[in-house]
Interface confidence: low
């Protein structure tokens, strides 16, 4: 559901990742969008504590920019997804091993909740930066 509004990020988890002046998309399908999205990030962030030093910063950037997407504040506020190329770089370059483990756990049903699924984008479904430079966010 892409109904929501733009607001400055005022959470804590993604403070170091998101630009200070960034407007993020808050999804009104949640009763309290700020709190719900922050909880999503927080839950997924804890999983990242065990990943490699190479993967972690890339994964954190992907995670924060996926859950707190950049917001285009027109008449109808619109979330701007991450560019496919950046998502693939994290998946196949920085975090290849960790991504495989996560996908395997998902298929085997080892996650207790579906919360992590919301925090991991499907790279193939994201727009390419080469189609329309304004259609996606560059990390």
């Amino acid at each position: 559901d892409n109904k929501g509004y733009c607001a400055q990020y005022r959470g804590e988890v993604c403070n170091a990742v998101l630009a200070k002046d960034a407007l993020v998309f808050l999804n009104t399908s949640y009763a309290d969008p700020e709190e719900a999205q922050e909880l999503l990030v927080h839950t997924a962030w804890n999983e990242l504590k065990v990943v490699s030093p190479v993967c972690r910063p890339a994964a954190e950037a992907l995670l924060c920019n996926h859950i707190f997407q950049e917001c285009s504040p027109g008449v109808v506020p619109t979330p701007i997804p991450i560019c496919r190329e950046y998502c693939l770089a994290v998946k196949e370059l920085f975090c290849a091993k960790e991504w495989l483990v996560m996908e395997e756990k998902t298929h085997r049903g080892l996650y207790r909740s579906e919360m992590h699924l919301l925090s991991v984008p499907e790279c193939s479904k994201l727009p390419s930066m080469h189609w329309d430079p304004t259609a996606c966010a560059r990390l």
Partner: antibody
């Protein structure tokens, strides 16, 4: 050091449009909200609205139907237009920078007096 | 809109003495991130307003340490530990939590 300078006509006729420009010098206009605030003589401060460098705007609901703001990043300027003015719009108009880090207006222009009179 | 109410509206003070200004908001300015979105400004005679305190209690760059901000939620206070002649002017509180940002009516500090 960033400085702001308002410019525009000091006298506007009733029912006409007030137009002001704020020039940002000593730094970039990018990545900030830029704001207009006014102060009628001997009275308090009223927030008119703000514009982000992307061009997105937020206006005070009390003035929304009459206000238009724009930004020209190439010139490091942003502008205010207030239509259908009356004597009640006579005030000192300030431009100011809204600093995300402080959540406050950390830099102000010196203000420009605009009188609405025939 | 959030309504900001200041008191007193006029404050005569003897140099060297302390001064205190109160500001109340019609709804809480405490965000769940722990910050109070309340700023204080001073407008000296013939000048533009200048930032004194941001986010309730943080002194802006260059502001003397005799100025301090306190409070949380809906009740806030600006204190000047020892008033100096250069402190004269009108003090405004402003809420930065919601659009439109709104100011208090102002408190005029004058030297006795």
């Amino acid at each position: 050091q960033v400085q702001l300078q308002e410019s525009g006509p000091g006298l506007v006729k009733p029912s006409e449009t007030l137009s002001l420009t704020c020039t940002v010098s000593g730094g970039s206009i990018s990545s900030y909200y830029w704001t207009w605030i006014r102060q009628p003589a001997g009275k308090g401060l009223e927030w008119i609205g703000r514009i982000y460098t992307s061009g997105s705007t937020d206006y005070n609901p009390s003035l929304k139907s009459r206000v238009t703001m724009s930004v020209d990043t190439s010139k490091n300027q942003f502008s205010l237009k207030l239509s259908s003015v009356t004597a009640a719009d006579t005030a000192v108009y300030y431009c100011a920078r809204y600093n995300w880090n402080d959540d406050a207006f950390d830099i102000w222009g010196q203000g420009t007096m605009v009188t609405v009179s025939s | 809109d959030i309504v900001m109410t200041q008191s007193p509206l006029s404050l005569p003070v003897t140099p060297g003495e302390p001064a205190s200004i109160s500001c109340r908001s019609s709804q809480s300015l405490l965000h769940r991130n722990g910050y109070n979105y309340l700023d204080w400004y001073l407008q000296k005679p013939g000048q533009s307003p200048q930032l004194l305190i941001y986010l309730g209690s943080n002194r802006a760059s260059g502001v003397p340490d005799r100025f301090s901000g306190s409070g949380s939620g809906t009740d806030f206070t600006l204190k000047i530990s020892r008033v100096e002649a250069e402190d004269v002017g009108i003090y405004y509180c402003m809420q930065a939590l919601q659009i439109p940002h709104t100011f208090g009516q102002g408190t005029k500090l004058e030297i006795k």
